[in-house]
């Protein structure tokens, strides 16, 4: 439902991929129970929410992760929604940490951040973690997403 | 505050309920510092949240819980967010998962779920548990709501 | 972006501050990305969020923190989320809570609260913890704000 | 289109059990969940249970939780609901129905249906 041409409704939700790539920057599709308002909001490379529109946002992710005290690096599992804006340096908006689980094989913990932000024309979201290998993708387990106020 | 006769401002907040029940649907009230915005969101049998409009909604919960490692299943805690509508499947809309603590009697987590849908006239959310009887009730642990966007 | 002059857009999100203060009550400031739409929000005191306006609010605040079981009470950590209204009794909206950890020197937890109230002019909103010098200040890791409706 | 063929109805006696079957085939065979819909006479079309392809998450209805088990065997294109301690009020006709991939939360897609097959309970 729109609130009107000139101020369409814009909110996304994606769902978790698992990925091969080594990248700390966790994958996304547009599949199962998806949300995807119209192009003024658009998934790229499967990887960050794009927008078109000048405005407030409220932006969240949830990631849940199975992750071992013994198996893991000493420093604890952490979770960020970063922003890149055209012509700005990166920054991370939002960050979660959880010390990895004593249980074997592994202990599953969620996380969920969530925000109010001002995002320019142009301006990509995107979430970090700081290991993939460990992310939980089974459903509903793991989404991004966003909605202008 | 309404947006107009055509657009009502839609949004509920509700209370968790202990209950005698052996359901692992969490049970809720209309208590408290509750919200209920009007008859276009309504809470049916003390368990789901129905909406009567179509439209994108942002529906959350949180749920608190007290367990312990040796009392419990080997299973994670998992809560669930789930979605029922007419003539479809019911289906999972978001889930998360916290292992047990080893603290004794039991460790207390809190769990937040929350998410961007699509809801059809109709439609009601509920939240499904593991085991209802290690979820906190006291003032504030556990609610469930949605605001339509 | 203004919804019109009569509705404006209300927004705040604000950064978790480091504090000498002994209170219970966590500090907040404007700075890095923080969001201030108008000044029918407002941070008093470094320490609420107060708004001038009647209405539906989707409140939310994130903490981060870290403990260790065996330096820490026996209690768990506990973050909450608290109503002021002129003339009316400090109320807990939300709270969540997580057992310390086993991990040394501490381990990393994060927590996030979140829904939707209905607020009064002049009523404020403020986050509460059981223990401020376990709050984690790094960028991203603890915030608080709410948007209305 | 995907085409669903139900098998296992039958006549049994309350307390009883029974095994219904769905094999889904059809060209480029893309199905996100495949579950189980009853009628009995004179009713709507309820819900029974789901099973979810990508990783085999299950839900069913209230009415059902503890008697009846949904599978899958993905090799076969093939959904299973097992039904124990059966009830009169479980007497119906059980529809198969499929949910094809890429279906958003804001695209409604049509399910794929079986043509049904009857469950009576009765002594």
């Known amino acids: 439902m729109q609130k009107g041409d000139q101020n369409p409704q814009i909110a996304a939700h994606v769902i978790s991929e698992a990925s091969s790539k080594t990248t700390s920057v966790l994958q996304w599709a547009e599949k199962g129970y998806y949300t995807m308002s119209n192009n003024l909001v658009t998934l790229e490379n499967g990887k960050q929410l794009t927008v078109k529109r000048q405005g407030l946002y409220y932006i969240y992710a949830q990631v849940t992760f199975c992750s071992n005290r013994e198996a893991s690096s000493q420093a604890p599992f952490i979770a960020s929604l970063c922003l890149k804006s055209p012509g700005r340096f990166e920054r991370i908006l939002l960050r979660a940490a959880n010390t990895h689980s004593s249980a074997k094989p592994c202990g599953q913990q969620s996380i969920h951040l969530g925000g109010v932000f001002e995002l320019q024309p142009g301006a990509s979201v995107f979430v970090n973690v700081t290991d993939p290998s460990q992310v939980s993708h089974g459903t509903g387990f793991t989404s991004f997403g966003l909605l202008k106020l | 505050m309404q947006k107009g006769d055509q657009n009502p401002q839609i949004a509920a907040h509700v209370i968790s309920e202990a209950s005698s029940k052996t359901t692992s649907v969490l049970q809720w009230a209309e208590k408290g510092y509750y919200t209920m915005s009007n008859n276009l969101v309504t809470l049916e049998n003390g368990k789901q949240l129905t909406v009567k409009r179509q439209g994108l909604y942002y529906i959350y919960a949180q749920v608190t819980f007290c367990s312990n490692r040796e009392a419990s299943s080997q299973a994670p805690f998992i809560a669930s967010l789930c979605l029922k509508s007419p003539g479809r499947f019911e289906r999972i809309l978001l889930r998360a998962a916290n292992t047990h603590s080893s603290a004794k009697p039991c460790g207390q987590q809190s769990i937040h779920l929350g998410g961007v849908f699509e809801l059809q006239p109709g439609a009601s959310v509920f939240v499904n548990v593991t085991d209802p009887s290690q979820v906190s009730h006291g003032t504030g642990f556990t609610s469930f709501g949605l605001l339509k966007l | 972006m203004q919804k019109g002059d009569q509705n404006p857009q209300i927004a705040a999100h604000v950064i978790s501050e480091a504090s000498s203060k002994t209170t219970s009550v966590l500090q907040w400031a404007e700075k890095g990305y923080y969001t201030m739409s108008n000044n029918l929000v407002t941070l008093e005191n470094g320490k609420q969020l107060t708004v001038k306006r009647q209405g539906l609010y989707y409140i939310y605040a994130q903490v981060t923190f870290c403990s260790n079981r065996e330096a820490s009470s026996q209690a768990p950590f506990i973050a909450s989320l608290c109503l002021k209204s002129p003339g009316r009794f400090e109320r807990i909206l939300l709270r969540a809570a997580n057992t310390h950890s086993s991990a040394k020197p501490c381990g990393q937890q994060s927590i996030h609260l979140g829904g939707v109230f209905e607020l009064q002019p002049g009523a404020s909103v403020f986050v509460n913890v059981t223990d401020p010098s376990q709050v984690s200040h790094g960028t991203g890791f603890t915030s608080f704000g709410l948007l209305k409706l | 289109e995907v085409q669903l063929v139900e098998s296992g109805g039958g006549l049994v006696q309350p307390g009883g059990s029974l095994r219904l079957s769905c094999a889904a085939s059809?060209?480029?065979?893309?199905?996100?969940?495949m579950g189980w819909f009853r009628q009995a006479p004179g009713k709507e079309r309820e819900f029974v249970a789901v099973?979810?392809?990508?990783?085999?998450?299950?839900l069913y209805a209230d009415s059902v939780k503890g008697r009846f088990t949904i599978s899958a065997d993905n090799s076969k294109n093939t959904a299973y609901l097992q039904m124990n301690s059966l009830k009169p009020e479980d007497t119906a006709v059980y529809y198969c129905?499929?949910?094809?991939?890429?279906?958003?939360?804001?695209?409604?897609?049509?399910?794929?249906w079986g043509q049904g097959t009857l469950v009576t309970v009765s002594s």
């Open positions: 059809g060209s480029g065979l893309s199905i996100n969940a």
């Open positions: 129905a499929a949910e094809p991939y890429g279906s958003g939360s804001s695209l409604i897609s049509e399910y794929d």
């Open positions: 099973i979810y392809s990508s990783d085999g998450s299950t």
